[in-house]
């Protein structure tokens, strides 16, 4: 999917009321310097490219993320401000019902949600120069 | 089963405003945008806007913005449209409809609809 | 915003024949159109959605195609309760928008 037509002050302003919150929540009790961030972005629409893969594909040791309150929340921001967005969600809607899993917090998707964390705000600062 | 009713018929005077209710049941109220729909006098339906409990926040068609309020209670499973500054074009049935915004992604059921009058 | 034709406006049937409805929307907006029955007095009811998904509940007499700017809705044998007002909508993008209705009427 194509992010380059989304509608990224929205989302911008659903990440910083509601979604942010949510990461925070997930990662509390975890120092803020415990995982270094790897994962980057070079602009809104890869930056959400990022997103979407972090939060929505299963990894090698943590495959629960998209039941987590946070990962609901992306995927409607991008369903709403996203043109075409949720026509590409059908299949992976119904796939993702069928290998529904019990929600684990696993030490890798702490550190896969800190690099969540890390690459939202790169997208809220699309100005700045790379590191 | 799913049910989205709301309140009763209204008649305003131009200039007033007029809050119509949409109370939801028979589904989780968060995972659905409740949307909403108006239809003057044989005409075609129109697109006003949008609530999202889950975001806790609206999208409104240009046309109505700075006079249309969208909200819900989400204690309530009820959702809310305020219309201001009434005028007698704005005299027709609104709907609303719930659209699911983590699945299915369409409008897939709707109240019975509320008739607004806008007369002198 | 994505603007969506009807046509035609009204479609004079009797009982029995095929309908075929067509919607052409300003922009390419892939499979994102749904289409809509509404009767008198009633609220629309969900025929279609994505273009050709069906419903359950609802009749396997109405079938829907098309993608990009074209979209059919075809009713293969018109039942005396299928005369009404059906619309395209799209939800493509923001702000999400309906066609301006084609009537379906007793010949």
């Known amino acids: 999917y194509d992010f380059t037509n989304c509608d990224f002050e929205k989302i911008k302003a659903a990440y910083l009321s509601t979604i942010s919150k949510d990461l925070i929540t997930y990662m509390s009790g975890t120092k803020s310097t415990e995982f270094n961030n790897t994962v980057s972005c070079s602009n809104r629409p890869h930056c959400l490219t990022e997103i979407q893969s972090l939060t929505f594909n299963p990894t090698a040791g943590c495959a629960s993320l998209a039941k987590e309150m946070f990962a609901m929340k992306t995927k409607a921001a991008l369903a709403i401000w996203c043109p075409g967005y949720s026509e590409t969600q059908i299949n992976a809607t119904q796939a993702m019902k069928k290998r529904r899993k019990r929600k684990v917090t696993t030490n890798k998707c702490l550190e896969q949600v800190s690099q969540l964390q890390g690459l939202w705000r790169r997208f809220n600062r699309p100005l700045l120069k790379q590191q | 089963q799913v049910q989205l009713v709301q309140s009763g018929a209204e008649v305003k005077k131009p200039g007033a405003s007029v809050k119509v209710s949409c109370k939801a049941s028979?589904?989780?109220?968060?995972?659905?945008?409740m949307h909403w729909v108006r239809q003057a006098p044989g005409q075609g339906l129109e697109w006003m806007g949008t609530?999202?409990?889950?975001?806790?926040?609206?999208d409104y068609a240009q046309k109505f913005q700075g006079r249309v309020t969208m909200t819900a209670d989400t204690s309530t499973s009820t959702a809310y449209m305020e219309l201001r500054s009434l005028r007698s074009d704005d005299t027709a049935v609104y709907y609303c409809?719930?659209?699911?915004?983590?699945?299915?992604?369409?409008?897939?059921?709707w109240g019975q609809g509320t008739l607004v009058t806008v007369s002198s | 915003e994505i603007v969506l034709t009807q046509s035609p406006g009204t479609l004079s049937l009797s009982p029995g024949e095929r309908a075929t409805l067509s919607c052409r929307a300003s922009?390419?907006?892939?499979?994102?159109v749904h289409w809509y029955q509404q009767k008198p007095g009633q609220a629309p009811r969900l025929l279609i959605y994505?273009?050709?998904q069906s419903i359950s509940g609802i009749p396997d007499r109405f079938s829907g195609s098309g993608s990009g700017t074209d979209f059919t809705l075809t009713i293969s044998r018109l039942e005396p309760e299928d005369f009404a007002v059906y619309y395209c909508?799209?939800?493509?993008?923001?702000?999400?928008?309906f066609g301006q209705g084609t009537k379906v009427e007793i010949k």
């Open positions: 409809a719930r659209m699911g915004v983590t699945h299915s992604y369409v409008m897939d059921a």
């Open positions: 028979g589904y989780i109220f968060t995972d659905y945008a």
């Open positions: 609530f999202i409990p889950l975001l806790d926040t609206s």
């Open positions: 922009q390419p907006i892939s499979i994102s």
């Open positions: 994505f273009a050709s």
């Open positions: 909508q799209q939800t493509f993008s923001l702000p999400y928008t």
